[in-house]
Amino acid sequence: EEELQVIQPDKSVSVAAGESAILLCTVTSLIPVGPIQWFRGAGPARELIYNQKEGHFPRVTTVSESTKRENMDFSISISNITPADAGTYYCVKFRKGSPDTEFKSGAGTELSVRAKPS
């Protein structure tokens, strides 16, 4: 079995303020078992945007049905985008454990926010 890769096909996405942003992410393997998390930014100060395993993320919905068998699509939609949401978003695969540990990150998608059309 080939080692899992995290694919973020869009290097950048531009969204008008007030609209929803769709950030694409797929993985290439069911192995290892473990959740996906999305972050804005990298390094120790990165901001958690979505955690498949736990937490409440009212602005985030998953694009596909992540509970379904053999699902490898972990794209998300973020609603009501504002300029404060601009940044680079990383889709990160974690490996099941106690606690779950980071396994592999996507290359990132830069979100830019356009002014709301008048």
Partner: antibody, heavy 119, light 110 residues
Framework: QVQLVQSGAEVKKPGASVKVSCKAS????????INWVRQAPGQGLEWIAM????????HYNQIFKDRATLTTDTSTSTAYMELRSLRSDDTAVYYC????????????WGRGTLVTVSS | DIVLTQSPDSLAVSLGERATINCRAS??????????IFWYQQKPGQPPKLLIY???NRDSGVPDRFSGSGSGTDFTLTISSLQAEDVAVYYC????????FGQGTKLEIK
């Protein structure tokens, strides 16, 4: 950490029904399947059914399709398994188990609920 | 339905020796590039514990003396050097279709 806490032991008469609960914590309940498995005294494991709490999709072992019903209460992160028309050979430990990889496998298990069917 | 048959039903192995448990499926459990076989360990009075998923992948925290192998219809759980705490009943399970378990193999110390 993931925890599945099951309801206490039950003693039932033949023909009665039992409803076993499984309260989940440590994860988002609607993001992972719950399986139910039973084990008769001194016997092996027997898969009963599974449920996706996000939309209540269920899959049943044909053996149990007419007698078992799985439900969930997402407000309390609790899964339920009801078994009707109980017989003495339904005496078993009933386990709930969470599928962390959507592989139709059982990653985390409750401690089990002993259901005794006796007249 | 796919039936899983484990062999042997029981097994006695000396401490430090290799233990091998087999699981044969009545038809192939390979699909989408994966072998949909899982192995569990159950000690007395405890729920089962997942050891191996998708035939050959150790679950988190499982000692590396446990390994899984096989493809298609024939699968093996191997304990490379038996420890006293490995005494248990071992079950295979498939999920190529809806899940079923093998009948179990009781592992004891010789």
């Amino acid at each position: 950490q993931v925890q599945l806490v099951q309801s206490g032991a039950e003693v039932k008469k033949p023909g009665a029904s039992v409803k076993v609960s499984c309260k989940a914590s440590g994860y988002t309940f609607t993001n992972y399947w719950i399986n139910w498995v039973r084990q008769a005294p001194g016997q092996g494991l027997e898969w009963i059914a599974m449920i996706d709490p996000s939309d209540s999709e269920t899959h049943y072992n044909q053996i149990f399709k007419d007698r078992a019903t799985l439900t969930t209460d997402t407000s309390t992160s609790t899964a339920y398994m009801e078994l009707r028309s109980l017989r003495s050979d339904d005496t078993a430990v009933y386990y709930c188990a969470m599928d962390y990889g959507s592989l139709y496998a059982m990653d985390y298990w409750g401690r089990g609920t002993l259901v005794t069917v006796s007249s | 339905d796919i039936v899983l048959t484990q062999s042997p039903d029981s097994l006695a192995v000396s401490l430090g020796e290799r233990a091998t448990i087999n699981c044969r499926a009545s038809q192939s459990v390979r699909s989408s590039g994966y072998n949909w076989i899982f192995w569990y360990q159950q000690k007395p009075g405890q729920p089962p514990k997942l050891l191996i998923y998708l035939a050959s992948n150790r679950d988190s925290g499982v000692p590396d003396r446990f390994s899984g192998s096989g493809s298609g219809t024939d699968f093996t759980l191997t304990i490379s050097s038996l420890q006293a705490e490995d005494v248990a009943v071992y079950y295979c399970q498939h999920s190529r279709e809806l899940p079923t378990f093998g009948q179990g193999t009781k592992l004891e110390i010789k």
